[in-house]
Interface confidence: low
């Protein structure tokens, strides 16, 4: 002629210690657990009815506490890990292309005392900008009148005509772009006269890359004479400091 222990709930707990059995008509009260709050008008009690079962509480009257709404950052997005602002959840921040995040990428909805609060301040998305790329001696770059460059903006360098008989060579990347760290993708190139010496080889001969003069990136290929072998590389390139790389090879018996 009695009910067993009352039902348990995820979000509620009994206000009194449960007993092994209860008389018909006896009532138990529930309170919201820590981190949950009462959502009227649902009941928070249950009664042992004459069928020796507990009068059901149709819906849990307690709901998880939630952190305050955080809007998308300007030029970015705030993404909830599972669609609700309740405690235990995470809010992920990402910035649009061309912007970078200042602050923490993830905020956590945490319980502080009995309140649900975010673990920190929301970050901000700051525009990625590069200062104008360096000016170079004996050359110029496109968009030289622009003062601020945005993410992925590119400039191209070119060398001026040389005053003397030898042309300026462009050393480095001719096109550089504004990267996501507000720096240019490469150092500015250099414009200078690069001229390597005539590549003399004993007991061998040049077979490709012939020229009157050997400027930057000129490539020369050698072949050994019969009965000799090459010490070093048979292919050399004129590098930016006007020397051959690797050095001109030797031929030995």
């Amino acid at each position: 002629d009695a009910c067993g222990p009352p039902p348990t709930f995820e979000a509620m707990e009994l206000t009194s210690k449960p007993k092994p059995y209860y008389k018909v008509g006896e009532q138990v009260e529930y309170d919201c657990k820590k981190g949950y709050h009462h959502f009227a008008p649902f009941l928070t009690h249950s009664i042992c009815d004459r069928n020796h079962t507990w009068l059901p509480i149709s819906d849990e009257p307690c709901v998880k506490k939630v952190c305050h709404y955080i809007p998308n950052p300007l030029h970015g997005e705030a993404i909830l890990a599972n669609g609700s602002y309740s405690f235990g959840n995470q809010l992920h921040f990402i910035c649009n292309d061309g912007y970078y995040l200042i602050g923490k990428e993830i905020l956590y909805c945490e319980l502080k005392g009995s309140d649900a609060v975010w673990s920190g301040r929301p970050p901000i998305c700051q525009k990625i900008v590069c200062k104008p790329p360096p000016k170079i001696n004996n050359g110029k770059h496109t968009f030289s009148d622009v003062e601020v460059f945005e993410y992925l903006d590119a400039v191209t360098y070119s060398c001026d005509p040389a005053p003397g008989p030898d042309p300026f060579s462009l050393i480095g990347e001719s096109t550089i772009y504004c990267r996501d760290n507000s720096l240019w993708s490469d150092d500015a190139p250099e414009c200078k006269v690069v001229k390597c010496r005539f590549p003399v080889i004993e007991n061998g001969k040049q077979i490709a890359g012939f020229g009157k003069k050997f400027y930057y990136k000129a490539t020369v290929i050698f072949e050994r004479d019969k009965g000799f072998h090459i010490i070093g590389s048979d292919t050399i390139v004129c590098n930016s400091n006007s020397t051959w790389d690797p050095p001109v090879p030797k031929c030995a018996k």
Epitope: I102, K104, S119, R121, V129
Partner: antibody
Framework: EVQLVESGGGLVKPGGSLKLSCAAS????????MYWVRQTPEKRLEWVAT????????YYPDSVKGRFTISRDNAKNNLYLQMSSLKSEDTAMYYC???????????????WGQGTLVTVSA | DIQMTQTTSSLSASLGDRVTISCSAS??????LNWYQQKPDGTVKLLIY???SLHSGVPSRFSGSGSGTDYSLTINNLEPEDIATYYC?????????FGGGTKLEIK
């Protein structure tokens, strides 16, 4: 209590190198962005380097880029500044600095060490 | 780079006075401005971040205001321990830069 103790300063010739260290205590070092800020003999403050909590993001001003390297050892609670190709204009008091309490990484230089003096002179 | 200018390099005031220290930026910095205090012994403290937010442990007699390019730090009811040099700093754009400082002395 947040404590930042710098060491490694001294007299060095132009073109020389020096490595500064900062021993951090009183907080979870690996949770915070860290910075080096220097003060010139004329009392001007200059930001020198930034490193993110995990060491992924590193920033420098142009004045030291390519010459200075900031790094950290989260296991040892240490911050470092490797300085090379030193110039007379690098002469300064170098401060190790931690960001603010509020679980952010804004450049709010909240906690400063007592500094270590670097003198670059022939 | 954004230049930060503190036009007054030194300032004399009497105890109990209200003191205002100014700082201007070479371009708008959207309130991304901090104030620091450096005592004569070299110790540096953050006073105010984001133009007007008081850092923890800083007395409420300190306040900050401003917008665009012009910012100020106000100290109400000047006390002996406020004798120091005060620096502004912008974090609107890399590289982060400081003003030249304003040295506050007692008359």
């Amino acid at each position: 209590e947040v404590q930042l103790v710098e060491s490694g300063g001294g007299l060095v010739k132009p073109g020389g190198s020096l490595k500064l260290s900062c021993a951090a205590s009183g907080f979870t070092f690996s949770d915070y962005y860290m910075y080096w800020v220097r003060q010139t003999p004329e009392k001007r403050l200059e930001w020198v380097a930034t490193i993110s909590d995990g060491g992924t993001y590193i920033y420098y001003p142009d004045s030291v880029k390519g010459r200075f390297t900031i790094s950290r050892d989260n296991a040892k609670n240490n911050l470092y500044l490797q300085m090379s190709s030193l110039k007379s204009e690098d002469t300064a008091m170098y401060y190790c600095v931690r960001d603010i309490d509020y679980d952010t990484s804004y450049p709010w230089f909240a906690y400063w060490g007592q500094g270590t003096l670097v003198t670059v002179s022939a | 780079d954004i230049q930060m200018t503190q036009t007054t390099s030194s300032l004399s005031a009497s105890l109990g006075d209200r003191v205002t220290i100014s700082c201007s930026a070479s371009q708008g910095i959207s309130n991304y401005l901090n104030w620091y205090q450096q005592k004569p012994d070299g110790t540096v403290k953050l006073l105010i971040y984001y133009t007007s937010s008081l850092h923890s442990g800083v007395p409420s007699r300190f306040s900050g205001s401003g917008s665009g390019t012009d910012y100020s730090l106000t100290i109400n009811n000047l006390e002996p321990e406020d004798i120091a040099t005060y620096y502004c700093q912008q974090y609107s754009k890399l590289p982060w830069t400081f003003g030249g400082g304003t040295k506050l002395e007692i008359k």
